[in-house]
């Protein structure tokens, strides 16, 4: 172990992964395993997250620094630093508290996690409904009526023909 | 809600041993580490000592006399008390942290306490 013999705080000497021992003269101490400091000059190590039931690893904990978790399979995280796991369910469904629940008939969800959001409305921005929404996706918004009209094409013109007897380029 | 319960405390002569328990409900130790504190009447809180994960720390009055360990199974931590003197006469604590060692801790949780009494 270091003895530090800074004139200051002695305590600033002691490197991350230690803590500065008050009741030892301060004499920078590991941290335990399974705990960690992840800053020099700290009077404590903090213990190490564990990662159990629907958590699981993503990164041990080290002598400087945190575990981390994620969620098992069937799971995704919530909140800073996967503080929660919820239950992911099917696109086209949205998490209730009596479980996954199809979308209501103009909602979709197409992620796994999140709740059902209603279709977009087309003719808010004067456009047509291309293509029909599920519940699973939303739906496509495509030209408005107005371009349609006869002799009004939504269909990008055809390149000019190349001449004969020229290569591309 | 967790709540922390010592046990074992009494009257015991000088010289005498005590083993004090501290056992945890609504919650496990797995994740915290266990100190434990004591408090003579008129005298401000004394840090003891503080277990975790096979590790013990001391407060720098117990010259050996006093050794924390841990029962797993039984989700408690001891407080062996050897050669006991007449100014370990105290209400002792158990509390827990999610910081080792607990000497300069506030800890998040700590129980009722249970007295000890030294005397001939």
């Known amino acids: 172990f270091e003895r530090t013999r800074s004139l200051q705080d002695p305590c600033s000497n002691c490197p991350a992964g230690t803590f500065c021992d008050n009741n030892r003269n301060q004499i920078c101490s590991p941290c335990p395993p399974n705990s960690f400091s992840s800053a020099g000059g700290q009077r404590t190590c903090d213990i190490c997250r564990q990662c159990k039931g629907v958590f699981r690893t993503r990164k041990e904990c080290s002598s400087t620094s945190n575990a981390e978790c994620d969620c098992t399979p069937g799971f995704h995280c919530l909140g800073a630093g996967c503080s929660m796991c919820e239950q992911d369910c099917k696109q086209g469904q949205e998490l209730t508290k009596k479980g996954c629940k199809d979308c209501c008939f103009g909602t979709f969800n197409d992620q796994k996690r999140g709740i059902c959001r209603p279709w977009t409305n087309c003719s808010l921005d004067g456009k047509s409904v291309l293509v029909n929404g599920t519940k699973e996706r939303d739906v496509v918004c495509g030209p408005s009526p107005a371009d349609l009209s006869p002799g009004a094409s939504s269909v990008t013109p055809p390149a000019p023909a190349r001449e004969p007897g020229h290569s591309p380029q | 809600e967790v709540q922390l319960v010592e046990s074992g405390g009494g009257l015991v002569q000088p010289g005498g041993s005590l083993r004090l328990s501290c056992a945890a409900s609504?919650?496990?130790?797995?994740?915290?580490?266990v100190g434990w504190f004591r408090q003579a009447p008129g005298k401000e809180r004394e840090y003891v000592g503080t277990?975790?994960?096979?590790?013990?720390h001391y407060g720098d009055f117990e010259n050996n006399r006093f050794t924390i360990s841990r029962d797993n199974a039984k989700n408690t931590v001891y407080l062996q008390m050897n050669n006991l003197r007449p100014e370990d006469t105290a209400v002792y604590y158990c509390?827990?942290?999610?910081?080792?060692?607990?000497?300069?801790?506030?800890?998040?949780?700590q129980g009722q306490g249970t007295q000890v009494t030294v005397s001939s």
């Open positions: 609504g919650r496990t130790f797995d994740n915290y580490a």
């Open positions: 509390a827990i942290s999610l910081k080792y060692p607990m000497a300069t801790v506030t800890p998040d949780y």
């Open positions: 277990y975790w994960s096979g590790y013990a």
